[in-house]
């Protein structure tokens, strides 16, 4: 059939990507799996413009993104280069803080209440955002 050019139902289109915003919280790994089960990935922020778009939709709520350093260096889940890419950390973050008493440091990144990023314990049940590129999302009919 002809290629569709719209996002699945309940997803929001923006700049050739589709975004889905959760209403509940999950640990980072479950949020990651949730997005993968939707043939998507946790949101990868590549520009200030995309940062503002996501921030507008999530509001002042801790929300996971697709950035982690569970295996050493910081990595985006889709392979986007971290070192040369967009960053929006809070001052003095990431700090891999061990003082939370939950064991280990902080290996997963999230949007904070002001939109800037913080690293936190990956087991915390935060909301999350899934993202998929529009050409991938349109390979199948939208969810009905």
């Amino acid at each position: 059939g002809s290629e569709r050019t719209c996002c699945p139902v309940n997803w929001v289109e923006h700049e050739r990507s589709c975004y889905w915003f959760s209403r509940s919280g999950k640990a980072w790994a479950d949020a990651d799996n949730y997005c993968r089960l939707e043939d998507a990935h946790l949101v990868v922020v590549t520009s200030w413009e995309e940062q503002k778009f996501v921030q507008h939709h999530i509001g002042p709520v801790n929300t996971w993104m697709g950035l982690h350093d569970q295996n050493g260096p910081w990595k985006w889940v889709d392979g986007t280069d971290y070192e040369t890419g967009f960053k929006n950390w809070r001052p003095e973050q990431p700090d891999d803080w061990y003082g939370h008493g939950l064991g280990g440091g902080e290996d997963c990144a999230h949007f904070t209440d002001d939109g800037r990023w913080n690293d936190d314990v990956c087991q915390r049940p935060y909301r999350w955002v899934c993202e998929t590129e529009l050409d991938k999302a349109s390979q199948e009919p939208p969810l009905l």
């Epitope: 309940n10 959760s22 209403r23 509940s24 999950k26 640990a27 790994a29 479950d30 799996n33 949730y34 993968r36 089960l37 939707e38 043939d39 991938k136 390979q139 199948e140 009919p141 969810l143 009905l144």
Partner: antibody
């Protein structure tokens, strides 16, 4: 009516391979994630594997990781489970189970199940 | 993985009895839990989703309750066709996990 029909089970020697199929009808197959769940004789249910609706992501129980491969052909409305390096403990009835449209509450949920196909691993 | 503790593992009851089965989880799963009925040689059939919502076509004598870590399936008045094995499934956290099952037998 939603229907799932498994096939491909049988008797196989340890170390051997089998490919299970699950033919789906009565719903828009490519809108749903799909799962395989197994049940050893006289035992409970064990989730085995899942696949996203377009097949881009796959998930496996630790007990089968590296030996089993889940796949799907949306043009044929069919789900597959390729089982390699089979062991005696893989002996079970294998069910395919339909996922649900994903909202927060339906992560890895399963609503409709097929009747199952029996896999026996024995020498 | 989330551990599912289902109890009792078996029970004997008579037609007309009220039967209660419990599923406890090792961590909070909100209400992301389903209940299934399985008869010998048959596929599991979902009775309850989202902990307390009745699946379409399932008799109203079945009900589910609970949230967090403790969940209950109740059959208000057991019928002959209800003698079967019942399982809970949590789908809040990966991997999805089932309870060990409860076999409901005729007394």
């Amino acid at each position: 009516e939603v229907q799932l029909l498994e096939s491909g089970g049988g008797l196989v020697q340890p170390g051997g391979s089998l490919r299970l199929s699950c033919a789906a009808s009565g719903f828009t197959f490519n809108n749903y994630a799909m799962n395989w769940v197994r049940q050893a004789p006289g035992k409970g249910l064990e989730w085995v594997s899942a696949i996203s609706r377009r097949g881009g992501s796959t998930f496996y129980a630790d007990s089968v990781k590296g030996r089993f491969t889940i796949s799907r052909d949306n043009s044929k409305n069919t789900l597959y489970l390729q089982m390699n390096s089979l062991r005696a403990e893989d002996t079970a009835v294998y069910y395919c189970a339909k996922g649900e449209l994903l909202e927060d509450y339906y992560y890895f949920a399963m609503d409709v199940w097929g009747q199952g196909t029996t896999v026996t691993v024995s020498s | 993985d989330i551990q599912m503790t289902q109890s009792p593992s078996s029970l004997s009851a008579s037609v007309g009895d009220r039967v209660t089965i419990t599923c406890r989880t090792s961590q909070d799963i909100r209400n992301d839990l389903g209940w299934y009925q399985q008869k010998p040689g048959k596929a599991p059939k979902r009775l309850i989703f989202a902990a307390s919502s009745l699946q379409s076509g399932v008799p109203s004598r079945f009900s589910g309750s609970g949230s967090g870590t403790e969940f209950t399936l109740t059959v208000s008045s057991l019928q002959p066709e209800d003698f079967a094995t019942y399982y809970c499934l949590q789908h809040n956290s990966y991997p999805p996990t089932f309870g060990g099952g409860t076999k409901v037998e005729i007394k």
